[in-house]
Interface confidence: medium
């Protein structure tokens, strides 16, 4: 069966300077390939976090994704700023051998609304 990516919250509100968790779970780790978080859609979308080892300031994974059969790819964004507002998508990719990774499924998106302190 096809992997499903679930973002249970349609929206979250967070005060500037605080942190927020964006939840994302998958039903399967197959096919092999990374999970990445993006803000926005289409050509304007921005890579926010990738579960592939790179360092992303202010963002870290919530659960231990090195554990076997971990299906939780939620992230915590710290010190949120108004510029962080937007819709965040958790996206599952299939790893390519020689060609680029292929995007195969996305969560429904979570709108982050940043409140003034």
């Amino acid at each position: 069966t096809e992997v499903k990516v679930t973002q249970p919250e349609k929206s979250v509100s967070v005060a500037a300077g605080d942190s927020t968790i964006l939840n994302c779970t998958v039903t399967s780790l197959l096919p092999v390939g990374p999970i990445r978080w993006y803000r926005g859609v289409g050509q304007s979308r921005l890579l926010i976090y990738s579960f592939t080892g790179e360092h992303f300031p202010r963002i870290r994974n919530v659960s231990d994704t090195t554990k076997r059969n971990n299906m939780d790819f939620s992230i915590r964004i710290s010190n949120v700023t108004p510029e962080d507002a937007g819709t965040y998508y958790c996206v599952k990719f299939q790893r390519g051998s020689s060609e680029p990774d292929t995007e195969i499924q996305s969560g429904g998106g979570t709108e982050v609304y940043v409140l003034a302190k």
């Epitope: 249970p8 349609k10 289409g42 819709t87 499924q105 996305s106 429904g108 998106g109």
Partner: antibody, heavy 119, light 108 residues
Framework: DVQLVESGGGVVRPGESLRLSCAAS????????MNWVRQAPGEGLEWVSL????????YYADSVKGRFTISRDNSKNTLYLQMNSLRAEDTAVYYC????????????WGLGTLVTVSS | EIVLTQSPGTLSLSPGERATLSCRAS??????LAWYQQKPGQAPRLLIY???SRATGIPDRFSGSGSGTEFTLTISSLQSEDFAVYYC??????????FGGGTKVEIK
């Protein structure tokens, strides 16, 4: 059972204002995002505006931005749409629509109220 | 903004026949697509969500399929009450939430 009842429609002249209401019952109103969707005579559906359950997240279609204001009173289980500077192209049946609690599709709709803008 | 294109604009069929309605998205919406039915003078009614899941109380003659940019609503055997206008709606890119232009299923 979920019930959504719109009111406030009528005939107005271009440039005038109108306030639509949607009385909700049969569900926990404050827990659901609510929308206005309109349908011009003989045309398709056009999303107008949405407001989150708490009222703090609001969006508008470009066609109404700056002229329409969505609001809600959770103590009265009522959704509102204040329409200012009305134009002939705003003539439509306006539906109040309740969103699914997880995704932005519409589980329940009101019967609609007709707004006619004509000189 | 994601644009949804429905085809055909009108489908003329007889009761008992199979209806196949198409909805095409300008970019992938994965399976975040809903279908609604609207009869004259009535509000739309949710039929399908998640591209293929039937809403509560919807008969099993209605089925949805597809993912990405191509979607289909199938009515396996048209009943008299099924003659109506059908709209698709995407809820992947939001807002604005967008609807297709509709397909009218009329009696031949």
């Amino acid at each position: 059972d979920v019930q959504l009842v719109e009111s406030g429609g009528g005939v107005v002249r271009p440039g005038e204002s109108l306030r639509l209401s949607c009385a909700a019952s049969g569900f926990t109103f404050s827990s659901y995002d609510m929308n206005w969707v309109r349908q011009a005579p003989g045309e398709g559906l056009e999303w107008v505006s949405l407001i989150s359950g708490s009222g703090e997240i609001i969006y508008y279609a470009d066609s109404v931005k700056g002229r329409f204001t969505i609001s809600r009173d959770n103590s009265k289980n009522t959704l509102y749409l204040q329409m200012n500077s009305l134009r002939a192209e705003d003539t439509a049946v306006y539906y109040c629509a309740k969103e699914n609690n997880r995704y932005r599709f519409f589980d329940d709709w009101g019967l609609g109220t007709l707004v006619t803008v004509s000189s | 903004e994601i644009v949804l294109t429905q085809s055909p604009g009108t489908l003329s069929l007889s009761p008992g026949e199979r209806a196949t309605l198409s909805c095409r998205a300008s970019q992938s919406v994965y399976t975040y697509l809903a279908w609604y039915q609207q009869k004259p003078g009535q509000a739309p009614r949710l039929l399908i969500y998640g591209a293929s899941s039937r809403a509560t109380g919807i008969p099993d003659r209605f089925s949805g399929s597809g993912s990405g940019t191509e979607f289909t609503l199938t009515i396996s055997s048209l009943q008299s009450e099924d003659f109506a206008v059908y709209y698709c709606q995407q809820y992947y890119d939001r807002p604005p939430l967008t609807f297709g232009g509709g397909t009218k299923v009329e009696i031949k």
